[in-house]
Interface confidence: low
């Protein structure tokens, strides 16, 4: 339904508060280096303009597209050239090329200072003094650091952030109330950002078909009682929502997400029995709840898949008539029967089925040719099962920190060209699969673990894409979305790698390490471990363990010393010498 003024339409649908918040997110995700005050000024100007269009949709410029209006506004920033360099060239282009240009310049790893949390009293004072600015600052800081964060979900995070301050700033022990809530929001936010980044990568790098296949599999697992036609409708709508958000169309995205939540709740009887509680919540909570809802129970006595997809004489006829619909049905039927499989495994099975039909439906005896197709699934299913079993045993044996270290060594040996901060970040996140998934029973381990690993490996892929240094990473990231994890798992030690020159500075530590949190201290040690492996890729795990144990003892000793700095200087030299000797550097 066409509207005279798109900006007026969205303002009325979303309301002023959400409109302003979403425009701020959009601008901060595009111009990640701009100061907060500049963005607030731009948002206020856009909001005032939108109000004139609500009053009179025929007013000047109200008929322009949102991309045109927003792009024109962004291009008024005076410091565009000196702050963003070649991104300023986007402003010479016309829509839709201009928006595409802005999208291409989004930076997954912007050069921004780490967010330091102020004292609780300072935060509470700021919250009370100017609640609106305080919450806008939260949206701005998250959006500029996470340029693909799912905007309507960020509104939900902001609502929880506000609730935490409202409650805790009145509490007797403000810190005890607030800090755990902020930690939880931070961790959930990072996870949410990474999950959304995979959806956008899927759409942008592998296309709508790849995303739709993912959505069919996931929604069929979640809503196994829903008919195929119902799942297909939800997939189409969900694809539109995510295409919009990944494309920077945040107002349309938020509006369409609200419509989708409304539709799901109005039709929950034909979708899932698990939606009742979600549908009683306010909009932002409702949408979040639906996105996280547990899988419904599988319908009783589902017939064997073989009848329709192997034994039937009409397989090739049905396939030829509508390939993607037939494959979609296969994926739907397989996924609703297998909540115990990861989505990526289900997609590998569907791909194997498609490849078999492509080959067999052109053969002399198609049925004879594809009769054993399900036998080809067995090794595909067993590979992730075995890998997860092994790694969960290893995790249970080692604990999270040492498990992360084992992965750090493993991945540094596979792709030693990748930057040390990226290897540390990615390996730490890969290692979290243990505490996240190994506690689950067998039936939930694979969907938890392998789909989480897909999210983490996508972080590696997007960070590597910015500055490519390894052909092996590029190959695993670009060849197949669903085979990324098996591709990385299969990588052996990179024998072509020339060890890094030894640099004592890399292993020089100071007294400031003593005041770091346990997490930060771990990161320091893990950074040193990666550097050790880069210097000595053939070092055995025993050698590395010995050096790391010595390092831990050195830090502990010097942090207890009276003259810490002298201890770090003198003992540090001895440690470097001993490590060089131990590793034969």
């Amino acid at each position: 339904d066409a509207h005279k003024s798109e900006v007026a339409h969205r303002f009325k649908d979303l309301g002023e508060e959400n409109f302003k918040a979403l425009v701020l997110i959009a601008f901060a995700q595009y111009l990640q280096q701009c100061p907060f005050e500049d963005h607030v000024k731009l948002v206020n100007e856009v909001t005032e303009f939108a109000k004139t269009c609500v009053a009179d949709e025929s007013a000047e410029n109200c008929d322009k597209s949102l991309h045109t209006l927003f792009g024109d506004k962004l291009c008024t920033v005076a410091t565009l050239r000196e702050t963003y360099g070649e991104m300023a060239d986007c402003c010479a282009k016309q829509e839709p090329e201009r928006n595409e240009c802005f999208l291409q310049h989004k930076d997954d790893n912007p050069n921004l200072p780490r967010l330091v949390r102020p004292e609780v009293d300072v935060m509470c004072t700021a919250f009370h003094d100017n609640e609106e600015t305080f919450l806008k600052k939260y949206l701005y800081e998250i959006a500029r650091r996470h340029p693909y964060f799912y905007a309507p979900e960020l509104l939900f995070f902001a609502k929880r952030y506000k609730a935490a301050f409202t409650e805790c700033c009145q509490a007797a022990d403000k810190a005890a109330c607030l800090l755990p809530k902020l930690d939880e929001l931070r961790d959930e936010g990072k996870a949410s950002s990474a999950k959304q980044r995979l959806k956008c990568a899927s759409l942008q790098k592998f296309g709508e078909r790849a995303f739709k296949a993912w959505a069919v599999a996931r929604l069929s697992q979640r809503f196994p009682k829903a008919e195929f036609a119902e799942v297909s409708k939800l997939v189409t709508d969900l694809t539109k929502v995510h295409t919009e958000c990944c494309h920077g169309d945040l107002l349309e995205c938020a509006d369409d997400r609200a419509d989708l939540a409304k539709y799901i709740c109005e039709n929950q009887d034909s979708i899932s029995s698990k939606l009742k509680e979600c549908c009683e919540k306010p909009l932002l909570e409702k949408s979040h709840c639906i996105a996280e809802v547990e899988n419904d129970e599988m319908p009783a006595d589902l017939p064997s898949l073989a009848a329709d997809f192997v034994e039937s004489k009409d397989v090739c006829k049905n396939y030829a008539e509508a390939k993607d619909v037939f494959l979609g049905m296969f994926l739907y039927e397989y996924a609703r029967r297998h909540p115990d499989y990861s989505v990526v495994l289900l997609l590998r099975l569907a791909k194997t089925y498609e490849t078999t039909l492509e080959k067999c439906c052109a053969a002399a005896d198609p049925h004879e040719c594809y009769a054993k197709v399900f036998d080809e699934f067995k090794p595909l299913v067993e590979e992730p099962q075995n890998l997860i079993k092994q790694n969960c045993e290893l995790f249970e044996q080692l604990g999270e920190y040492k498990f992360q270290n084992a992965l750090l060594v493993r991945y540094t040996k596979k792709v030693p060209q990748v930057s040390t901060p990226t290897l540390v970040e990615v390996s730490r996140n890969l290692g979290k699969v243990g505490s996240k998934c190994c506690k689950h029973p067998e039936a939930k381990r694979m969907p938890c673990a392998e789909d989480y690993l897909s999210v983490v490996l996508n972080q590696l892929c997007v960070l590597h894409e910015k500055t490519p240094v390894s052909d092996r990473v590029t190959k695993c990231c670009t060849e197949s979305l669903v085979n990324r994890r098996p591709c990385f798992s299969a990588l052996e030690v990179d024998e072509t790698y020339v060890p890094k020159e030894f640099n004592a500075e890399t292993f020089t530590f100071h007294a400031d390490i003593c005041t770091l949190s346990e997490k930060e201290r771990q990161i320091k040690k893990q950074t040193a471990l990666v550097e050790l492996v880069k210097h000595k890729p053939k070092a055995t795990k025993e050698q590395l363990k010995a050096v790391m144990d010595d390092f831990a003892a050195f830090v502990e000793k010097c942090c207890k010393a009276d003259d810490k700095e002298t201890c770090f200087a003198e003992e540090g030299k001895k440690l470097v010498a001993a490590s060089q000797a131990a590793l034969g550097l």
């Epitope: 075995n386 079993k389 092994q390 790694n391 045993e393 290893l394 080692l398 055995t540 795990k541 025993e542």
Partner: nanobody
């Protein structure tokens, strides 16, 4: 429950052979290096042989080199020690032990231990 169980010990004449087995239950051996150790009465426990998790790396104590062979069958979740040309000084209780990924030089770094199997070499 995680367990290692040795078997295959017994009485054998000097110059004879035995094959010891170390079977794991409650976990898979794929990610573990397995070491064989022995302890004669009144003596310290000593390393005999070890095989890394990949199976690609094996090592032997000088006193058994050329006579003993270590191997693994991950499908059966078992590691073997084939002992040829046995000598009376090989008499001891033989233990297997598991460590994550790599063989270790220090006995205490092994995570799981079996109960042991007696080997007696005597005429």
């Amino acid at each position: 429950q995680v367990q290692l169980q040795e078997s295959g010990g017994g009485l054998v004449q000097p110059g004879g052979s035995l094959r010891l087995s170390c079977a794991a239950s409650g976990f898979t051996l794929d990610y573990y290096a397995i070491g064989w150790f022995r302890q004669a009465p009144g003596k310290e426990r000593e390393g005999v042989s070890c095989i890394a998790s990949s199976g690609g790396s094996t090592n032997y104590a000088d006193y058994v080199k050329g006579r003993f062979t270590i191997s693994r069958d991950n499908a059966k979740n078992t590691v073997y020690l084939l002992m040829n040309k046995l000598k009376p000084e090989d008499t001891a209780v033989y233990y297997c032990a598991a460590a994550v990924l790599e063989c270790r030089t220090v006995v205490r770094e092994y995570d799981y231990w079996g109960q042991g199997t007696q080997v007696t070499v005597s005429s």
